[in-house]
């Protein structure tokens, strides 16, 4: 027979606590049963009758063993900048978290009360510290030799490409433009080989210099109009 033989309600021995999932009712001066998560106390215990529990109504919950007279109300529906990561059930409150591209500017015990969009670093600036669930992006100016030509909350400053001969020097918001002096492949005189434009380059989370071709026979078009390369025929 298990040691826990006394049935609730019962008067505890002096100096003894109630047992597992029980509470001491000050009025009845008895150890009584708690209600399980998802329930609440409909009728409190007396000296002769135990707690009567009832299920929480819709949109209300209790997460813990309890003897509360009413269940707690679930929080309001998630706003448009949030996603519901946990639904309101009889045993748990609704949890709203910020959707991608947003961070929690004002948190609550579980989830987020107020979301804000992640800061976007403008051209010439890169991400110094990425955004997290609870902190905004920190931008920094691109250091000499690096650039960012995007308005982005994720792009970092990337190194300028290394040219044998520079056609247009890079700056904080534009990559260097190289010109070819001794092409390594046979090309028609004055022909220029154009690879993918910068905007389709893969973004790195760490500043990893791209391998340079030696000697370079290409350049990358900067964003927006640019002067024709030396030896090009133009349009």
């Amino acid at each position: 027979l298990p040691a826990q033989v006394a049935f609730t309600p019962y008067a505890p021995e002096p100096g003894s606590t109630c047992r597992l999932r029980e509470y001491y009712d000050q009025t009845a001066q008895m150890c009584c049963s708690k209600c399980s998560p998802g329930q609440h106390a409909k009728v409190f215990c007396t000296k002769t009758s135990d707690t009567v529990c009832d299920s929480c109504e819709d949109s209300t919950y209790t997460q813990l063993w309890n003897w509360v007279p009413e269940c707690l109300s679930c929080g309001s529906r998630c706003s448009s900048d949030q996603v519901e990561t946990q639904a309101c059930t009889r045993e748990q409150n609704r949890i709203c978290t910020c959707r991608p591209g947003w961070y929690c500017a004002l948190s609550k015990q579980e989830g987020c009360r107020l979301c804000a969009p992640l800061r976007k670093c403008r051209p010439g600036f890169g991400v110094a510290r990425p955004g997290t669930e609870t902190s905004d992006v920190v931008c920094k100016p691109c250091a000499p030799g690096t650039f960012s030509n995007t308005t982005s909350s994720t792009d970092i400053c990337r190194p300028h490409q290394i040219c044998n001969v520079v056609a247009i020097p890079g700056n904080a918001s534009m990559d260097a433009v190289c010109t070819s002096t001794s092409p390594t492949r046979s090309m028609a005189p004055g022909a220029v080989h154009l690879p993918q434009p910068v905007s389709t380059r893969s973004q790195h989370t760490q500043p990893t210099p791209e391998p340079s071709t030696a000697p370079s026979t290409s350049f990358l078009l900067p964003m927006g109009p640019s002067p024709p390369a030396e030896g090009s025929t133009g349009d």
Partner: antibody
């Protein structure tokens, strides 16, 4: 962070008593039970009982009833377990552990106190 | 008192293995089953409570299942730091009781 720090090792003679302390930090001491669990060398774990620091009330494993006393000093967030009439079988590592009375688990444990009973 | 019995006292496995440790209660304990990890010289750690609820900070490779009298702790992909002794414990009825422990060793 939540921590339980226990007193140092003890060597006692049969028939004597031992008192082990457990200092809590990182949470509100009076709101959680402090349990005591022991482990004899190469053996499993055995629950001794708990004390509720808010009022000092206790709950014991009947195997230890009459030999164990649990007390607390809320001003220094410390719980104590005293075991009397020691015998060689009481040689063990004694742990304090913070308990949850709804699910019956122990979520934070002390580092353990070795008690050796030898003549 | 409720007796808790592990299916084996020791178990050999390799890093990356899926490991299951089982525990049987001498009577129905509903879902009130907790799992702990113990390493030599370290504090005991709660892994799982109420059969399947993961304690905060515990890696998701640990999971618990079962009900009534038979319970299982599963480690989906064994990591080097998982070699330890594992204990089950019932939280259904006083006195609270532990199983004898299963020592997980490197194969």
């Amino acid at each position: 962070q939540v921590q339980l720090v226990q007193s140092g090792a003890e060597v006692k003679k049969p028939g004597a008593s031992v008192k082990v302390s457990c200092k809590a930090s990182g949470y509100t001491f009076i709101t959680y039970d402090i349990n005591w669990v022991r482990q004899a060398t190469g053996q499993g774990l055995e629950w001794i009982g708990w004390i509720y620091p808010r009022d000092g009330n206790t709950q014991f494993n009947e195997n230890f009833q009459g030999r164990v006393t649990m007390t607390r000093n809320t001003s220094i967030s410390t719980a104590y377990m005293e075991l009397s009439s020691l015998r060689s079988e009481d040689t063990a590592v004694y742990y304090c552990a913070r308990g949850d009375r709804d699910y019956g688990y122990f979520d934070v444990w002390g580092q353990g106190t070795t008690v050796t009973v030898s003549s | 008192d409720i007796q808790m019995t592990p299916s084996t006292s020791s178990l050999s496995a390799s890093v990356g293995d899926r490991v299951t440790i089982t525990c049987r209660a001498s009577q129905d304990i509903s879902n009130y089953l907790n799992w702990y990890q113990q390493k030599p010289g370290k504090a005991v750690k709660l892994l799982i409570y109420f059969k399947s609820k993961l304690h905060s900070g515990v890696p998701s490779r640990f999971s618990g299942s079962g009900s009534g009298t038979d319970f299982t702790l599963t480690i989906s992909s064994l990591q080097p730091e998982d070699f330890a002794t594992y204990y089950c414990q019932q939280g259904n009825t006083l006195p609270l009781t532990f199983g004898g422990g299963t020592k997980l060793e490197l194969k």
